[in-house]
Interface confidence: low
């Protein structure tokens, strides 16, 4: 049978290297030789390229080499397939070399901010060493912030006579490091170069872009004044590298703006001692380039009743995240403040906080929380300048088995009964929420028994024991990850009771 007709012919001119054409050979049952027939030099010349490989994959491509390649030029390419039964020709295909040229990637050699121009970086590069002199180049520049994975792209062209191989990338975030890559193509070509090596550059610093402000209200002291811990951080979306020289804070009673107090600090928190009435607190951050917008927070009066709207709240772990969800009875509340800190016996020093808008859930990556630590999580509803009553729960980002079992005691030993008591495992050793306790007990040389009770129970009475018999008992505390036994205790039931 005649060979299959070659289809899907595609050609690429690797500029000043070779012109390679490939095709789909079809299902060949016998040895087939392919010849690529070409006319070039605007139809004035013609030549052939013959495949000489024995493997069918390699037989489906053929290359022409310098010096018999010119650009600009128009080619016709036709592929002939020949076997013992005859010859079959492909369709004639037509190619403009400028449309199929592919160059090496450009080389970025500098990414820099431009003095005095905000939110911009200038990219300078060297054109690919081998690129057609007669053609303009088009470029795609892709960029992302260093801590992002998604690229943005911008396309532009450069005139071949343009000595200025630079591009000003605008509309960026201030004082942010960007990763830049560049690719190019002959303007008329459908083939892009590979991407250049990535290069980093940073935009100019600006005045701080804003603050988020929060507070921790403490009980009033004997003199009626109330300690308020002010906390603040860069606004969400602020440049990671944004620098601040300091903060100006001013506050005044809601009823009298004339009593404004001001202070400066370089810390990221401040303890104020306020009177019992409501106060307004405002602050800005500043650096050598200016001030941020003002952040403002209202501190309620001591006797002020805060509204309640969170009805239920739960936490669960899903796909490497701790997810906290709640339900609210107030439809007009759509901003919430989340506080979280490790539940340790000392006063929390590492309070974290974050606002959530337009959602009644909050997620945090598991790896942002310490595994096996219990966290207190509180959600505050926020409506305009009012902060509602928080709803609090405890949760673990990741549970483990307790690092020690319960400390156990035996009490009220009788003839056939005994009371087993145990202490709660210290918080630091629990590694998870204790869901139950299991009491294991066994007579010497006898069969073992067990009884599981819920985590609120810290003692259990064993009954129907054998008189005058040695027993071994231990209590296991379990989390969702598994259980850990406490030390085993031996006891012996009495021979007779005082009532006998």
């Amino acid at each position: 049978a005649l060979p299959a007709k070659p289809e899907n012919i595609s050609c690429v001119y690797y500029y000043r290297k070779n012109l390679t054409c490939t095709w789909s050979p079809g299902k060949e049952t016998s040895y087939t030789q392919y010849t690529v027939k070409r006319t070039y030099a605007f139809g004035e010349k013609h030549d052939n390229c013959t495949t000489n490989s024995s493997t069918s994959e390699n037989r489906a491509s053929c290359s022409f080499f310098l010096p018999r390649i010119t650009i600009p030029d128009n080619y016709t390419i036709e592929v002939e397939a020949e076997n013992g039964d005859g010859v079959i020709k492909s369709h004639m295909t037509y190619w403009r070399l400028e449309n199929i040229a592919k160059t090496e990637p450009p080389k970025i050699f500098r990414v820099k901010p431009v003095l005095g121009i905000k939110r911009m970086i200038q990219i300078e590069w060297i054109k690919p060493e081998l690129a057609p002199v007669s053609s303009d180049l088009k470029y795609t520049l892709r960029f992302r912030t260093v801590n992002s994975t998604s690229w943005m792209e911008v396309n532009f062209a450069k005139n071949r006579k343009d000595k200025n191989q630079t591009y000003n990338l605008t509309g960026l975030q201030p004082f942010t490091e960007y990763v830049i890559a560049l690719r190019c193509a002959v303007k008329e070509s459908k083939f892009w170069s590979d991407w250049s090596q990535e290069k980093m550059g940073m935009t100019e610093e600006e005045a701080p872009c804003g603050l988020e402000l929060w507070r921790v209200l403490k009980p009033a002291e004997a003199d009626g004044r109330r300690p308020v811990r002010l906390l603040w951080k860069k606004a969400r979306g602020a440049p990671v590298l944004e620098k601040t020289l300091g903060y100006n804070i001013w506050y005044y009673p809601e009823s009298n703006t004339n009593l404004t107090e001001t202070m400066n600090t370089t810390n990221q928190q401040l303890e104020l001692h306020l009177g019992g009435e409501s106060f307004w607190v405002s602050m800005i951050s500043y650096n050598s380039l200016g001030k941020s917008p003002v952040a403002t927070l209202r501190i309620p009066a001591i006797q002020e009743k805060s509204f309640q709207c969170i009805e239920v709240m739960q936490a669960c772990v899903a796909e490497d995240q701790l997810v906290v969800k709640w339900q609210s009875s107030a439809l007009d509340v759509n901003t919430w403040m989340i506080e979280w800190f490790p539940d340790v016996d000392s006063e929390p020093t590492t309070l974290s906080w974050e606002s959530v808008s337009q959602a009644t859930n909050w997620t945090i990556q598991q790896d942002k929380l310490k595994p096996f630590w219990c966290y207190n999580i509180s959600v505050y509803p926020m409506l305009h300048d009012k902060v509602g009553e928080p709803y609090s729960i405890q949760a673990y980002a990741k549970e483990g088995v307790p690092s020690e079992g319960p400390e156990t005691k035996v009490e009220n030993i009788g003839v056939k009964t005994v009371t087993i008591t145990w202490k709660e495992i210290p918080k630091s050793e629990r590694k998870g929420i204790i869901c139950n306790y299991t009491i294991f007990y066994q007579a010497e040389g006898g069969k073992g028994f067990s009884k599981t009770v819920n985590s609120s129970i810290l003692q259990y009475g064993l009954e129907s024991l054998k008189r005058k018999t040695s027993y071994i008992v231990q209590v296991m505390a379990s989390t969702s990850a598994g259980g850990t036994n406490g030390t085993s205790i031996n006891f012996k039931t009495l021979s007779f009771s005082v009532f006998e």
Epitope: K112, L115, E129, M202
Partner: antibody, heavy 121, light 107 residues
Framework: QVQLVQSGAEVKKPGASVKVSCKAS????????INWVRQAPGQGLEWMGL????????DYNQKFKGRVTITADESTSTAYMELSSLRSEDTAVYYC??????????????WGQGTLVTVSS | DIQMTQSPSSLSASVGDRVTITCQTS??????VAWYQQKPGKAPKLLIY???TLAKGVPSRFSGSGSGTDFTLTISSLQPEDFATYYC?????????FGGGTKVEIK
């Protein structure tokens, strides 16, 4: 290894021109800018200009107001610096130096050995 | 043009001394400062670029710091081979300019 070898010392009369060459080897000539820097006897360093051999693009210190011309010959991987209308204060050691593309933009990581140009009547 | 003001113009020190040379620029040039060492009759040698990055083969006793307009070259423990003239140069953009140089001499 990277090397920049400059032409030998020259003695010129005021008003004449001098052309100093700088032959590069050990790297892709078209990939790095060549700077020219001079140093008058007992004085500091003064940047004269640069050339990008890839596209022939040049950048000059305006102080030399058209007296300096920097060129490059890709075929011989050689850069040239020509200074015209010489005066006695042009007496200096002239250096070519490769732009530190691998190290940092507009820095000079490899230097020629220097060419002493003496302008004297 | 960006002016580079280097100080001191000369200093005397002994082997083992800690030596500090400063360079002030007329405008903010971020970290784009290089430092060179030059010995009599020789071409300059690049020591530091981007204000603090050591060039290949430069001993770790040399260090650079600063950003914006104030830059410092420090030699933590001066060695006999370090007596030379040191120049700062901005590599922000053209035209490139150098500081006037600091000659480090033996006390």
């Amino acid at each position: 290894q990277v090397q920049l070898v400059q032409s030998g010392a020259e003695v010129k009369k005021p008003g004449a021109s001098v052309k100093v060459s700088c032959k590069a080897s050990g790297y892709t000539f078209t990939g790095y800018v060549i700077n020219w820097v001079r140093q008058a006897p007992g004085q500091g360093l003064e940047w004269m200009g640069l050339i990008n051999p890839y596209n022939g693009g040049t950048d000059y210190n305006q102080k030399f107001k058209g007296r300096v011309t920097i060129t490059a010959d890709e075929s011989t991987s050689t850069a040239y610096m020509e200074l015209s209308s010489l005066r006695s204060e042009d007496t200096a050691v002239y250096y070519c130096a490769r732009d530190g593309y691998d190290d940092g933009p507009y820095t000079m990581d490899y230097w020629g050995q220097g060419t002493l140009v003496t302008v004297s009547s | 043009d960006i002016q580079m003001t280097q100080s001191p113009s000369s200093l005397s020190a002994s082997v083992g001394d800690r030596v500090t040379i400063t360079c002030q620029t007329s405008e903010n040039i971020y970290r784009f400062v290089a430092w060179y060492q030059q010995k009599p009759g020789k071409a300059p040698k690049l020591l530091i670029y981007n204000a603090k990055t050591l060039a290949k083969g430069v001993p770790s006793r040399f260090s650079g710091s600063g950003s914006g307009t104030d830059f410092t070259l420090t030699i933590s423990s001066l060695q006999p081979e370090d007596f030379a003239t040191y120049y700062c140069q901005h590599h922000y953009d053209s035209p490139l300019t150098f500081g006037g140089g600091t000659k480090v001499e033996i006390k």
